[in-house]
Every structure is written in C-alpha cells, then in structure tokens.
C-alpha cells in the first residue's frame, strides 16, 4: 500500500541532492586551499541533519547551527557584495574582482545555490516530489530558513563600505520583500558599516535615466539613513562595459562613465 505523502505547492528536492552537495563541497575545498581541512562528509551530515525527519514547515535557524559551525570561513568584512534580483552579474563580477565576495562565493552559499530540499516528519526520506512554497505553504521551510540564516549572518559580518547590486530593469528596483530588503538591510551593523553603496544596473542600451532617483531607491536610502548608515548610489549604464573595465581597468574607454 503506497504511503500517503504531503503534497506541497513548490518543486521537490533537486535530483541527486546529496551527491550534488557532497560534490560541490569537494570542489569548493579543492579550489579554496584555506578550506581544504573541511570534512565534506561531516558537512553533508550536518546539512542533512537540519531537515531530515523534521516537518518541513517547522524548521528553525537552530537546526542549521551545526552546519554553520562547519562552514566557518574568513571573509574580509569590507569586501562584501550583496545583490538583489541580479545574481548572475554579481557572480560574474566577483569572478573577475576576486577579492570581493557574494554569499554564494562562501562555502555555505556555494553548496546551496539554486538547490531545493526538504524532508518529511518522522521519516528519513528526502521528498523529491514537492517541497513547501514560501508564499503558498509556509515560510519556515528548509530552503527559506537556510537562506535567511546565512544571509543574516553574512550581513552581520559586513563592515566599512558594503556594496549592493540592484536590478534597474525591475519595477521595484529595491524590493522590501526580497532577502536583501527583508533580511540583509536590517542586519547590517551601524557601528561597523559606514556606507551602503548601491549599484543600479541598467538593462536597456539607450537607458540614460538616473535610476538612483527611483522612489524605491529613495525608500532604501531612508531605511539605511534611519539606521545611521550612510547611503550612496551609482548608475551602471553599461553592465557589459562595467565588467570589461573591471577586467581591464587601464583601458582608455574606462575613464568615462559606465
């Protein structure tokens, strides 16, 4: 008799999830010599322990604490790049500007990037059929709690000038409901962070508007200023040229506005 299984509204656990996490861990520790001491089997065991046999709507930050401990890593606090709705460009940037870090450049972020996972209460099975959707089912699901936890800790670690890349093509360039808007903004530490500098990335070739004047950017400035952190904003009119100039800053065309 087939066992009844809870049907959730979101996609199920990513295929080959255990193998993917383990393989990513091994790859990361090979690429980053300072992390070569990490025992990837222990990392997987801690990751698994956070959600296996637990109700997927009842996950807490505490569940991920053993994993957090194993993911201990040096991140220069003044080299942090946050992003919202423009992940690919942020990652392309840190691949070139190697001394800056997005969350996904850390071990923990790298392990979980673009993956979905959940378990079932009282069974050791991983649910590959469906997982809770943040809106339709519950917010305390394994994926959402993981990203909320690591995003909060990442923002708490930041200091001096923190950069954030925002998508100028979105109707809400700054979205209060994004992870950046709901978690990271509120966990920057005013005693450590002097300035939040927003980079608004333009989508259209001929778009010469000053998107730093957008109402949602003004809203971000207001939130940040109330937290006693300075705010600055730059338009990145040509993201392709921006990346090219990060690669080759001596190029003569890189002195003009990008």
């Amino acid at each position: 008799v087939p066992r009844w299984r809870q049907q959730w509204s979101g996609p199920g656990t990513t295929k080959r999830f255990p193998e993917t996490v383990l393989a990513r861990c091994v790859k990361y520790t090979e690429i980053h010599p300072e992390m070569r001491h990490v025992d990837c089997q222990s990392v997987w065991d801690a990751f698994k322990g956070a959600f296996i046999s637990k109700h997927p709507c009842n996950i807490t930050e505490e569940d991920y604490q053993p994993l957090m401990k194993l993911g201990t890593q040096t991140v220069p606090c003044n080299k942090i790049l946050l992003w919202s709705r423009i992940k690919d460009l942020a990652h392309q940037f840190t691949q070139v500007q190697r001394d800056m870090f997005t969350l996904e450049d850390t071990l923990l972020g790298y392990l979980a990037d673009d993956l979905t996972w959940c378990g079932e209460f009282n069974t050791s099975k991983i649910n590959y059929q469906s997982c809770p959707d943040w809106r339709k089912d519950c917010s305390n699901n394994p994926v959402s709690v993981f990203w909320k936890t690591v995003s909060r800790r990442f923002a708490e670690a930041a200091c001096d000038v923190v950069h954030v890349m925002l998508n100028g093509s979105r109707s809400k360039i700054f979205d209060k409901n994004s992870t950046f808007g709901s978690v990271e903004v509120h966990n920057l530490q005013p005693e450590k962070v002097q300035t939040l500098e927003a980079w608004v990335i333009h989508g259209g070739r001929e778009d010469s508007r000053d998107l730093c004047q957008d109402p949602t950017i003004k809203e971000l400035e207001s939130i940040i200023s109330k937290r006693n952190i300075q705010f600055s904003c730059k338009n990145i009119y040509r993201p392709d040229k921006f990346l090219q100039c990060v690669k080759n800053p001596e190029d003569s065309s890189c002195t003009s506005e990008i």
Epitope: Q73, T74, V75, L108, R153, E156
Partner: nanobody, 117 residues
Framework: EVQVLESGGGLVQPGGSLRLSCAAS????????MSWVRQAPGKGLEWVST????????DYADSVKGRFTISRDNSKNTLYLQMNSLRAEDTAVYYC??????????RGQGTLVTVSS
C-alpha cells in the same frame, strides 16, 4: 572601528591550562555576540566558541566542550577563554572576533597557543 587585542597565549604542557583575553574597542561591546576561532599551522579557520552579548548563552565546538569556558566582562569590554586539559591538537593561533559566524574577519593579530612537552 572595531579593534581587538588578544593576549594570554604561550607554551604549555599537555594537560595544562591557559586563560586567553581579548580587549575590544570601537563598538558597543555588550551588544555583540563574540567568538573565539583558531587556526592551526597549515590548517583552515576553526570555530571554537561563541557567547551572547549578555553572556547568558554560550556554545562550543565538540572538540573543546567540557575543557574550554568562554566568558566576558562587559564592564571591561573584555572576552575570555579559559582553556583546561590542553592537548597537542589545541596548538593554534587563537583569534577573538565580533559576531557569531560563520563568517569572520581577522581584527587582531591573534595569540599563539603551543601545547607540547
């Protein structure tokens, strides 16, 4: 600007004790969780212990549980790590850091603990 200065390290025999101190300045010390992390020769960063801002809550790595005790004196802006029953594998540079991790930045120079007979 957050600044920390670790002290109290040294050479000690296996089974011995040391007390590390960390003097902090540049921020409201009592508002922040504080941690000890360590780096053994040729190894990566390892989290050791964390204490809440008030001092009411502590957490330890399994490898030091029952042997190390983290504490703080908020009136002196100072963090401590009492290390008992020291082992050769505790040999490392010990750093104190603001926050609870897992992401840390070195603020101080650290203090070297060498456990050897």
């Amino acid at each position: 600007e957050v600044q920390v200065l670790e002290s109290g390290g040294g050479l000690v025999q296996p089974g011995g004790s040391l007390r590390l101190s960390c003097a902090a300045s540049g921020f409201t010390f009592s508002s922040y969780a504080m941690s000890w992390v360590r780096q053994a020769p040729g190894k990566g960063l390892e989290w050791v212990s964390t204490i809440s801002g008030s001092g009411g809550s502590t957490d330890y790595a399994d490898s030091v549980k029952g042997r190390f005790t983290i504490s703080r004196d908020n009136s002196k802006n100072t963090l401590y790590l009492q290390m008992n029953s020291l082992r050769a594998e505790d040999t490392a540079v010990y750093y104190c850091a603001d926050g609870r991790g897992p992401f840390f930045d070195y603020r101080g120079q650290g203090t070297l603990v060498t456990v050897s007979s």
